[in-house]
Interface confidence: medium
């Protein structure tokens, strides 16, 4: 018996087609993805093949103005239109709290939404009961397939799930649910979830009875043969893991942003054992036409977005200096504003010993692309912020050793004075540079804001200590020469859309007046270029 699994993950509100790098589509003939194009391909496969499941491994939420405006209603609407068969909860599904998950998505979705390792307690238990499930048995042709869900147990640090949801260890939670499916005579079981490729592989290895793992969270691109676009494969598709009980378990993921549709064909014997598996992600490029009816629906929903982007979010009573002449040479107040917003967006009081789990932010000055003039009645709009942060990135959470941070700050000024983008803006960090010293030895003071304290204060960076830092995904991926971050990071979790972080902060503060306040200093008066 043959099953075709179509799968997406980490779509992050890319409902419209995008450019090849998943930012705003400029030249339509070269654009990719989007739900209209995805629907065309899904329908084509559904017509051609008998047993097809369309699955999503989480993180539909968060990533573009679509989510900012529609808050998840767009996810439910268009996933219903595409007739998804099941979805696993990702960490970003909790970005607007539990209410922001229940009302727009859980109550509106016409497909099961799954997670076996999230347990509700207290008053929430009855409120959310039945709205998401640990597993679902789906009829496919003449057979049944069990889908069991899982979600990153780090979600309380990455999003806003509140205090009434407990995130258990994935493997511990999955095993009893899979066992239950076996007692129900379900012998074909897919683990669908959102914990990253390393955990996907562990689930394949450790959870007895799981036949296939369909994952997300780490934006992993797998491919067999010559890849069709810019993404470099982390391994073959499917990635085969030998389980502890000797089975070959295919593990798949489909990169992110709806650029590819994962396509996996599995052959089962009559006892539900996997005999063979093969496939590849399908690049959703312009050779696949956009479905006209879905496209028309997208255009209808788009109207509200255009109106939103010119509305006032808040006011500034100071000039927001995002000029390259400032942000690539010295502390700039636009950099301070963005870093303050990044920290504010990551406030999670999950431990009495810590005022917050993270206190530090770094931001490449080259990522700040425009100032905002306060002489326009002080008005700040989404449109203004899109000029400051035009790349459609995310502000991510990483864990780094102090020694890596020191290298990053040395890189920040290794060729100071050439207006290059690697000069770092900061939050929760005080750095002093001496430019009279040789490159690689210019950081003379680096103090960081404590987290395990009731009164935050600055302490010298410790080389061997592990720190959490919020930074642009561009830096986490080694951009602007920050290879040491990519090479040495100990953990990396994708965060919220950059513009959304800043716009939420401005809306919350109502009036802003960021200052230049001595976060970055130069000894020997080397601060002029």
């Amino acid at each position: 018996w043959e099953l075709t699994i179509l799968h997406t993950n980490d779509v992050h509100s890319r409902l419209e087609q995008t450019s090849e790098d998943s930012s705003k589509c400029v030249n339509a003939s070269r654009c990719m993805g989007g739900v209209a194009r995805l629907f065309t391909k899904v329908q084509q496969i559904r017509r051609a093949e008998p047993n097809v499941l369309l699955l999503d491994a989480g993180d539909q939420y968060q990533g573009t103005i679509w989510f900012t405006v529609y808050k998840g209603a767009e996810v439910a609407h268009f996933m219903n239109a595409l007739r998804y068969d099941a979805m696993a909860l990702g960490n970003h599904e909790f970005d607007n709290g539990v209410e922001g998950l229940i009302e727009p998505l859980l109550k509106e979705a016409k497909f099961p939404i799954l997670s076996a390792n999230i347990k509700a307690k207290g008053p929430l238990a009855s409120q959310i009961s039945g709205l998401y499930l640990p597993y679902k048995v789906l009829p496919v042709g003449d057979e049944v397939v069990g889908i069991v869900g899982y979600t990153s147990k780090e979600t309380p640090f990455l999003s806003n799930p509140g205090t009434n949801l407990v995130f258990e260890d994935e493997i511990t939670a999955l095993q009893p649910e899979v066992d239950k499916l076996k007692t129900l005579n379900v012998n074909k079981i897919i683990a669908l979830g959102h914990s990253g490729f390393e955990m996907d592989k562990l689930i394949a290895q450790k959870v007895r009875g799981v036949d296939v793992v369909v994952g997300g969270h780490s934006n992993t691109f797998l491919y067999t043969g010559n890849p069709p676009s810019k993404e470099v494969p982390a391994g073959k598709y499917p990635f085969i893991v030998t389980s502890d009980d000797g089975r070959k378990v295919p593990v798949v993921q489909a990169y992110a942003f709806g650029k590819y549709l994962g396509y996996l064909k599995i052959e089962f014997d009559e006892r539900g054992n996997v005999i063979s598996s093969h496939g590849n992600p399908i690049l959703l490029n312009s050779s696949i036409p956009e479905d006209p009816s879905i496209k028309a629906d997208i255009n209808k929903w788009r109207i509200k977005l255009d109106n939103y982007s010119t509305q006032e979010l808040g006011k500034t009573i100071v000039y927001l200096d995002g000029s390259s002449q400032s942000c690539r040479f010295r502390e700039c107040n636009m950099g301070n504003l963005i870093c303050d917003a990044m920290i504010n967006n990551n406030l999670r009081h999950t431990d009495e010993m810590f005022w917050n789990h993270v206190s530090m932010c770094i931001l490449n000055g080259g990522g700040i692309r425009s100032p905002i003039d306060e002489r326009n009645n002080g008005t700040i709009t989404w449109e203004n912020l899109a000029a400051v942060l035009p790349f459609g990135g995310t502000f991510d959470l990483v864990q780094l050793k102090g020694s890596t941070l020191k290298k990053a700050f040395e890189h920040s000024v290794h060729r100071y004075g050439q207006s290059t983008g690697e000069f770092l803006q900061v939050g929760g960090i005080h750095v002093v540079y001496d430019l009279s010293r040789k490159p690689g030895d210019r950081v003379v003071k680096l103090d960081v804001l404590c987290t395990k304290c009731r009164v935050p204060s600055y302490d010298p960076l410790k080389m061997d200590e592990v720190y959490k830092v919020i930074l642009p995904n561009f830096l986490a991926n080694g951009g602007d020469g920050f290879q040491m971050i990519k090479d040495e990071l100990l953990r990396h979790d994708s965060g919220d859309q950059d513009i959304n972080v800043v716009s939420t902060y401005i809306s919350k503060m109502k009036v802003i007046y960021p200052a230049v306040e001595g976060r970055i200093k130069f000894s020997h008066h080397h601060h002029h270029h």
Epitope: T404, K407, E410, K438, G440, G481, Q483, M484, D487, E488
Partner: nanobody, 111 residues
Framework: QVQLQESGGGLVQAGGSLRLSCAAS????????MGWYRQAPGKLRDLVAK???????TYADSVKGRFTISGDNAKNTVYLQMNSLKPEDTAVYYC?????WGQGTQVTVSS
């Protein structure tokens, strides 16, 4: 401007060994790590081995088990120990760190 200076190349018989060195004029190994690349006549420059500033190493499949990269942070120097050399290892070997490159050193392996 950072200078990288390679040394240690030369002519050697197949099966023999050479040790290449690359000295940096400034403290960049600590930040970026270093790598060795090679370029045979009419071919593209290929990665041979690299070492991150944290000491993690990567090797091209063709040299695994024969070549060893190591670094001395204090001296801003990286080494490439090449054993069991083959004629196909003949190339100009370049040292690299971030976007800085050395001038190259010729390695010729005769059969």
């Amino acid at each position: 401007q950072v200078q990288l200076q390679e040394s240690g190349g030369g002519l050697v018989q197949a099966g023999g060994s050479l040790r290449l060195s690359c000295a940096a004029s400034e403290n960049i190994f600590n930040i970026y790590g270093m790598g060795w690349y090679r370029q045979a006549p009419g071919k593209l420059r290929d990665l041979v081995a690299k070492i991150t500033s944290g000491g993690r190493t990567t090797y091209a499949d063709s040299v695994k088990g024969r070549f060893t990269i190591s670094g001395d942070n204090a001296k801003n120097t990286v080494y490439l120990q090449m054993n069991s050399l083959k004629p196909e290892d003949t190339a100009v070997y370049y040292c690299n760190s971030y976007y800085y490159w050395g001038q190259g050193t010729q390695v010729t392996v005769s059969s």
